[in-house]
């Protein structure tokens, strides 16, 4: 399996009650606006064929996409949560900037691309869904990267 390096986040990032609460509140708010409950972005298909040691790198890709293509364009919505959660997630992204995989990551890119395609295909409702799954993103990052 490819070797991942610098793919670690300190546990303390996920032990801050205030920002954890705000992240989950944001996810809950967005999920109330999400009418497409049949589609899931962060689930078994995303992790399929990805070994445990590669998952932080996988989630880094998902986090970066979510920030750039979803949260920044939607930054005026779901206030006041958005203005607090986005900088927090951006800091996590920055801390994972040196997280790389040595070797073939095609299988990971394929899974991430499917998630991206689903969000793009659904348009704005795909972006809302991605925000509604920020609790899953948060927990996936925690489980994969600490």
């Amino acid at each position: 399996a490819p070797i991942s390096s610098h793919c670690r986040l300190d546990k303390s990032n996920f032990q801050q009650p205030y920002i954890t609460n705000r992240t989950f509140m944001l996810a809950k708010e967005a999920s109330l606006a999400d009418n497409n409950t049949d589609v899931r972005l962060i689930g078994e298909k995303l992790f399929h064929g990805v070994s445990m040691s590669e998952r932080c790198y996988l989630m880094k890709q998902v986090l970066n996409f979510t920030l750039e293509e979803v949260l920044f364009p939607q930054s005026d919505r779901f206030q006041p949560y958005m203005q607090e959660v986005v900088p927090f997630l951006a800091r996590l992204s920055n801390r994972l900037s040196t997280c790389h995989i040595e070797g073939d990551d095609l299988h990971i890119q394929r899974n991430v691309q499917k998630l991206k395609d689903t969000v793009k295909k659904l348009g704005e409702s795909g972006e809302i869904k991605a925000i509604g799954e920020l609790d899953l993103l948060f927990m996936s990052l925690r489980n994969a990267c600490i």
Partner: antibody
Framework: QVQLVQSGAEVKKPGASVKVSCKAS????????IHWVRQAPGQGLEWMGW????????RYAQKFQGRVTMTRDMSISTAYMELSRLRSDDTAVYYC????????????WGQGTLVTVSS | SSVLTQPPSVSVAPGKTARITCGGN??????VHWYQQKPGQAPVLVIY???DRPSGIPERFSGSRSGNTATLTISRVEAGDEADYYC???????????FGGGTKLTVL
């Protein structure tokens, strides 16, 4: 095929400890979390916690914090659950089960291990 | 913390449809899974992510959700479907696996 095989039944005295094993086969052990779920006689299912076989990281239900220890031995693809300071109400069937992410469905279960706590 | 409520028992005649409900406070964005447990056996996953069916599970088993209630539907019920059925979610905020109390399905 994919399976989880657990150790045999145990009888313990109150205050003692028990260690149950769960041997995985048919898949890459390090790629799935191993959870422990218990079921008291005639009762429902109760989640106890998980171990990440890749890192050894753990997450325990608050109820069992300080009394349960979940470990793994990668070399033999086996996970362990040790419960200390046993009480009579710990009498239950203990199951191991696997999941992909730490919060996904339990798609494969062990056959269960009956632990009886009696003086 | 999430609490999942199931009816203790459901009875149905063979060939008919059984519906088992699972009610939860505020689990709109949680994924519901269903397990079947026959006496003396380990649970078996029959429905995951609200409505997906693992391979090997008959098409007679289906899942759905509406608001704060998830439903496991078993159509054309057979005697072999008699078992306890448990719903389960992951309470992400408290990072806990949560099971419903279980429903005993009796085939008349």
């Amino acid at each position: 095929q994919v399976q989880l095989v657990q150790s045999g039944a145990e009888v313990k005295k109150p205050g003692a400890s028990v260690k149950v094993s769960c041997k995985a086969s048919g898949y890459t052990f390090s790629d799935y979390y191993i959870h422990w779920v218990r079921q008291a006689p005639g009762q429902g299912l109760e989640w106890m916690g998980w171990v990440n076989p890749d890192t050894g990281g753990t997450r325990y239900a608050q109820k069992f914090q300080g009394r349960v220890t979940m470990t793994r031995d990668m070399s033999i693809s086996t996970a362990y659950m040790e419960l200390s300071r046993l009480r009579s109400d710990d009498t239950a069937v203990y199951y191991c089960a696997r999941d992909l992410t730490g919060f996904d469905p339990f798609d494969i279960w062990g056959q269960g291990t009956l632990v009886t706590v009696s003086s | 913390s999430s609490v999942l409520t199931q009816p203790p028992s459901v009875s149905v005649a063979p060939g008919k449809t059984a519906r088992i409900t699972c009610g939860g406070n505020n689990f709109r964005n949680k994924r519901v899974h269903w397990y079947q447990q026959k006496p003396g056996q380990a649970p078996v996953l029959v429905i995951y992510y609200d409505s997906d069916r693992p391979s090997g599970i008959p098409e007679r088993f289906s899942g759905s959700r509406s608001g704060n209630t998830a439903t496991l539907t078993i159509s054309r019920v057979e005697a072999g479907d008699e078992a306890d059925y448990y719903c389960q979610v992951w309470d992400l905020f408290n990072d806990n696996g949560v099971f419903g109390g279980g429903t005993k399905l009796t085939v008349l």
